[in-house]
Structure formats: C-alpha cells, structure tokens
Interface confidence: medium
C-alpha cells in the first residue's frame, strides 16, 4: 500500500518543480509534504501535473488540513479550486472578497455551480457581503442558490441583489425564504413607484403577508394569475372576494380555469358562495348559504 | 407587437343598442385576454368586461351586468362588446386591450371609439 512506503532516500523534494512530474504517485504519495504544497501554490498551478498527481495533491492538503484550508491558502488556490468538492469549502473560513472573486473566475464555465455556491454561502456565513460584483462573477449561474444559502446567510445578502432576481430563480424556496427574501426586495424597491414597483415586487410576492397583499390591492396592480398562484395559501386565504377582485383586475376572469388547483381551491373554500356568485364567473366551491364557520377548518351548519 | 383598432362607436338614444368590435392586426391575439374599458369624461379608466384567451370565462362590471355582452373570434384575430339597454351613463370613449400576462405590462391598447347616450 502506498501509505506503508517511505520516501526513497534523495527523493524528499525542498519544492515545487518539474522533476516532481516524473514521480511515481507512489512517491508523491511517500514524499510531498502537504505544507509546502500550500506556500508554493502557485508552481502546483503552473506546472503540467497530471490530473491523478493533482489528485494526490490534494489528499496531502486534505490530510495536512482536516478541518478545512486556512484562508492563506485559499486566496492562492487559483485552478487547483477545480478539484475540490462543495462538501471542502463548506469547511472553509473565507472572509476576503477579493479570494471570492478570483476563485469564482476560476471556476466559470467549469460546469461548478455547486462549488461556487458553496463558496459565496461560506463567505457570507463568515460575514462577508454579497455587493453585485459578485453576483456578475457568478455569472450565468441562475440565482436560484439564493434558495441554498441558509436563512442567517440570506440576512448578509444585501438588497441590492434584488434586482438582479428572476421570475424562475425563486420558484424552489421555501417558505421562510421567500418570506426573508420579500422583505429584502420591499427595501431594495422602496424608491420605486407605481406599477414599475409592482412589476419589481411581483417575483418575491410568494414571501408576502394578508397584510401586504391587502396594501396591494389598494393599486390597481391588476396582478396576473401566473403571479397570484405563486402567493403562499396562508396569506391568500384571508383575502376577502371583493380584495381578491381588486388585486386581480381583469385578470379575475382567470380564477376559473385554477378553481380546482391549489392555491385557487384554497381560497374559494373559505369564502362565502353567494359572494362568489356575485362575480359571475361560474366559481364554485364556497360555503354555502346559511353556514356558519366556527372553525378555521371546520364548517357548521346553523341547527 | 399588436395593434388593436375600434370600431362601432357613435350616438344612439337611451335604451339602444351598439355592437363595438375590436380587430387585432400584427400578430395573432388568440392566446390574449381581451378586454374593454371605458374613460368618461374627467373620470379614471375603469374596466367593462374581460373574455380569457379560451373564450370560455367572462368578466363583467357590476354597472354592465345582464346589458353587456363580451365576445371573441380568434379566428378573425376580434373581440367584440354587444351593449344593449344603454343609459346615459354608459357614455365614454371605450378602449380595447390585449394581455398575455398582467394588465400592468405587455398591455397592448387601442385608440379608442367614443360612444354616446343621449336621454
């Protein structure tokens, strides 16, 4: 086993150079020292290692670090960062935004989304901010990842990105998320008036309170239903018919098509059936005539 | 892009009749929500009625109710707004719009017909 072997004598090298590519992994295994590969990382970049002595590199790296690089050395890392998995950086204390940045460059079109994710969510975790040079050097990763950081990473993520939010980048957040999220875009967008403001907002509206949409309705956003099905069913319930018509607009006309799916369904069952009738729109679903809820999930008939 | 143009406006007294029509032209408008709107004079622009791009759902102002009838051929790319028992205060230039998403972006809008109750 290559673990048993000691280094053949004269073989120990003082550096990173050439000569240790005609190595045989056995040897780099026996011989390198993980400490001097981390002062000299640069020659390791430099120098046409094959891919299984980079790999050999790096177990020494592992073994000399185990709980996870020093920032030293990550700030030199620059594409050896390819061959180190999400689950390392996770281990990782990054603070500089400057080391973000280099590796993110590294890292483009390297197919190394989950890397780079886990790098920012490492930084942010240190206490770094995201500011939107970061969000370019993530390139073409869409922001979904937004969803992968941690609510307390999500607190370190300034406003500013906000802008920066795309319709489907949302779409696998949960709850708590979108709620954290929401709040962030309501400060991002606070300068912004009228329905340029509403077309702004309308990504995040899933994290929305009753209480918002209840603000919201008073604007005439004519919100479509693409939109309104996306809002969280807790807050969509204490909408009133006459709430709900005026956050929709026209766009009501479109509640018939989503009455037996979900959010839809949820909202027409806790409303009174003659005051859906008033919509002429055909809904069904409410409660009916003469009933009574007593309970938030039960209906009583009058007795 | 879509262009949308109004016709069938005019003068008719209380208690009348007038079918407005609205022809699309530029590309086809069979996948729009189509509605109309109206503007009187020194009011806001307040919804009529709405028919979804199916043609199977409608949407009418309580003012309009059992009077207004809204309609679409989307092979002719046209919506229609059949008016009857008009009043006076169904006088307003009428406005037809087109919408894929929310009426608040990618609105296309007509220039408008005027039409006029006289008691």
């Known amino acids: 086993d290559a673990e048993q072997k000691a280094c053949p004598p004269g073989k120990e090298p003082y550096k990173v150079d050439e000569d240790l590519i005609f190595y045989q992994n056995w040897e780099l295994e026996a011989c390198v020292d993980g400490t001097m590969l981390a002062r000299q990382m640069d020659l390791v970049n430099e120098i046409p290692f094959t891919y299984e002595q980079l790999s050999i590199f790096k177990h020494k790296l592992d073994k000399t670090y185990p709980q996870g690089y020093p920032e030293s050395l990550i700030q030199q890392l620059g594409h050896f960062f390819r061959y180190v998995s999400p689950e390392d950086i996770h281990q990782w204390n990054v603070t500089s935004p400057d080391t973000v940045k280099t590796l993110l460059k590294v890292s483009k079109g390297q197919k190394m989304n989950a890397q780079a994710i886990a790098l920012v969510a490492c930084y942010l975790r240190g206490g770094g901010q995201l500011d939107e040079d970061m969000v370019k050097a993530l390139g073409d990763i869409p922001l979904s990842y937004l969803c992968d950081f941690s609510p307390q990473d999500l607190h370190s993520v300034p406003s500013s990105v906000m802008w920066l939010v795309g319709p489907q980048d949302l779409d696998k957040c949960s709850q708590r998320h979108l709620g954290l999220l929401y709040q962030k875009a309501c400060s991002a967008f606070q300068n912004v008036s009228g329905l340029e403001y509403f077309e702004k907002i309308k990504t995040f509206l899933g994290g929305a309170s009753v209480k918002d949409l209840r603000a919201l309705s008073q604007h005439n956003v004519s919100m479509d239903i693409a939109t309104f099905k996306r809002l969280q069913v807790d807050s969509l319930v204490g909408l009133s018919v006459a709430e709900v018509q005026k956050l929709l607009g026209p766009n009501i006309v479109d509640l018939k098509t989503e009455e037996d799916k979900s959010p839809v369904r949820d909202w027409l069952f806790r409303q009174h059936q003659k005051d859906l009738d008033r919509l002429g729109l055909g809904l069904q679903g409410g409660i009916p005539n003469g009933y009574l809820v007593l309970d938030f999930n039960v209906r009583e008939a009058f007795s | 892009q879509v262009q949308l143009v109004e016709s069938g406006g005019g003068l008719v007294q209380a208690g009348g009749s007038l079918r407005l029509s609205c022809a699309a032209s530029g590309r086809t408008v069979s996948t729009y929500n189509m509605a109309w709107f109206r503007q009187a004079p020194g009011k806001e622009r307040e919804i009529v009625a709405v028919?979804?791009?199916?043609?199977?759902?409608?949407y009418y102002a309580e003012s309009v109710k059992g009077r207004f009838t809204i309609s679409r051929d989307n092979p002719k790319n046209t919506v229609y707004l059949q008016m009857n028992s008009l009043k006076p205060e169904d006088t307003a230039v009428y406005y037809c719009a087109a919408t894929r998403t929310s009426w608040t972006e990618n609105t296309y809008w007509g220039q408008g017909t005027q039409v006029t109750v006289s008691s």
């Open positions: 028919i979804n791009w199916t043609g199977g759902s409608t």
